[in-house]
Interface confidence: low
Amino acid sequence: GDLLIQKTIKKQVVLEEGTIAFKNWVKTGTEVYRQFWIFDVQNPQEVMMNSSNIQVKQRGPYTYRVRFLAKENVTQDAEDNTVSFLQPNGAIFEPSLSVGTEADNFTVLNLAVAAASHIYQNQFVQMILNSLINKSKSSMFQVRTLRELLWGYRDPFLSLVPYPVTTTVGLFYPYNNTADGVYKVFNGKDNISKVAIIDTYKGKRNLSYWESHCDMINGTDAASFPPFVEKSQVLQFFSSDICRSIYAVFESDVNLKGIPVYRFVLPSKAFASPVENPDNYCFCTEKIISKNCTSYGVLDISKCKEGRPVYISLPHFLYASPDVSEPIDGLNPNEEEHRTYLDIEPITGFTLQFAKRLQVNLLVKPSEKIQVLKNLKRNYIVPILWLNETGTIGDEKANMFRSQVTGKIN
């Protein structure tokens, strides 16, 4: 019995035309939603003038349907048993699942001012930037609609820069009509224990953002894992959102719509400083903001974002060091709401439910030459928003899964 089941599973999880896995892999049968909470700054003037703590109030959720598009350019390579594809991006606003509209206004850090002052730190160019910032009536903070903030707006300060530069700014700009990849993953035909594991991303086995092992593209994309998952396993996966590979560990058994699944979570150790977790030494790319690599819980992904000072963390700086959240008032981290988990059906390795949570932050630093930043007396890693991307297997799919997979085994 067991051998027959193993054989059937092995056959059905291969990523090739005609298998259950392939059909769901090309176009997910699960509805995936991305909820955003925006950190609305309550005291912009006090921060700019007195370097006060930033008081934020989260507003959300604002919900978008995502990952509804089928993979594109799906190409099998029989020689190395891989399949390559592009994952197209698309987001559709869901008013019924949101607290407001895409036209809602928020007071947030001025993305262009923060980024330009970080990229161009030379005093001379900062004097030029200062005159352009003043001329465009830009400030340290700005008021933007949700739509502008997420998907892009033409920045008045950048529009004055006298050389060709992208004047459109947005946390996820460009998004719609773009694609992530090319991914090339093992299809499992020759070795089922490698199925869905990424061979190359954008034609490379490394990212070129980090040093040493931190730069490796490990594991799958987290949508599925090789079958016969054990509780003792450390599940590696790559997330282009955070420009790195990361891992999850077993936390508990969960019953999902009658299907026994293993809940794997991203442990706090994955976000620890190299002092606590020496493996993380290569995620510390500079010594000043990180206080000689002793700060933890924030990841500087500026190398992956054309030098823009973007820092990724868990929502509300969950698992981050006190020095990171100290200048920000209004944050309330809690594990239940803010950690990331994957519910994996162990026989097939399919992720049947997940919640991917992350926070996007921008670094802003004092600058003697830029008037709107010159009263700052410290560096701030400013939270802009956090997101919760979730997906759960539908009832119909769950019934089918129960009858075809778990029912047969039990």
């Epitope: 970080h118 990229i119 161009y120 730190q121 030379n122 005093q123 001379f124 160019v125 030029i128 820069v161 006298p162 050389y163 530069v165 010594k287 000043i288 190398k303 030098g307």
Partner: antibody, heavy 122, light 107 residues
Framework: QVQLQQPGSELRSPGSSVKLSCKDF?????????MTWVRQKPGHGFEWIGD????????IYGEKFEDKATLDADTVSNTAYLELNSLTSEDSAIYYC??????????????WGAGTAVTVSS | DIVLTQSQKFMSTSVGDRVSVTCKAS??????VAWYQQKPGQSPKALIY???YRYSGVPDRFTGSGSGTDFTLTISNVQSEDLAEYFC?????????FGGGTKLEIK
């Protein structure tokens, strides 16, 4: 590996001019990083000549070099240039280009060219 | 202009010793000081930035310290390959200026 490539030497006669090149092999960083030029004269230590930001062509010069040096850059070939005019024997020195590896323009430099030795002699 | 003075033009030391190279600024430069090593016939190599932060790949026997006007580069357990000239540089304000250099000789 070489990131900033400079010619080894240039010989010029007094009163003439010379244009020194510095090719950057990091095309991603070149436009956004300040390229700094310094010179080293035996017994005089290092002197800062000036900076150029290739993406906007913005320049700043040391007072001593305002009438002596002209900085420019070509973002197609990722090359920065330093032109020295009205050469005298006082301009004989090694001229270095330098920048920060990540393109952060703080004013310290961990990527240096090998230097071009300029000799002014009749 | 800010003048950086490296009072000792030459310093003599032995392999395994500890040596300190000093640099004094004519006015407060905060911690905006870098240190470079230059071997004969070579371009400078960056050792330290922001007064005390070591560049990756620089051996940990090189340590920078100081702020304001007084700065020190300390080499503990001197090795024969440390025979070189050491320069400080300030980038607190234009024009950037360099110290006159300290030549380290190995006895």
């Amino acid at each position: 590996q070489v990131q900033l490539q400079q010619p080894g030497s240039e010989l010029r006669s007094p009163g003439s001019s010379v244009k020194l090149s510095c090719k950057d092999f990091d095309s991603e960083v070149f436009p956004i990083a300040y390229m700094t030029w310094v010179r080293q004269k035996p017994g005089h230590g290092f002197e800062w000549i000036g900076d150029i930001l290739p993406s906007i062509g913005g320049t700043i010069y040391g007072e001593k070099f305002e009438d002596k040096a002209t900085l420019d850059a070509d973002t197609v070939s990722n090359t920065a240039y330093l032109e020295l005019n009205s050469l005298t024997s006082e301009d004989s020195a090694i001229y270095y280009c330098a920048r920060d590896y990540y393109g952060s323009s703080y004013g310290y430099f961990d990527v240096w060219g090998a230097g071009t030795a300029v000799t002014v002699s009749s | 202009d800010i003048v950086l003075t490296q009072s000792q033009k030459f310093m003599s030391t032995s392999v395994g010793d500890r040596v300190s190279v000093t640099c004094k600024a004519s006015q407060n430069v905060g911690t905006n000081v870098a240190w470079y090593q230059q071997k004969p016939g070579q371009s400078p190599k960056a050792l330290i930035y922001s007064a005390s932060y070591r560049y990756s790949g620089v051996p940990d026997r090189f340590t920078g310290s100081g702020s304001g006007t007084d700065f020190t580069l300390t080499i503990s357990n001197v090795q024969s390959e440390d025979l070189a000239e050491y320069f400080c540089q300030q980038y607190n304000s234009y024009p950037y200026t360099f110290g006159g250099g300290t030549k380290l000789e190995i006895k």
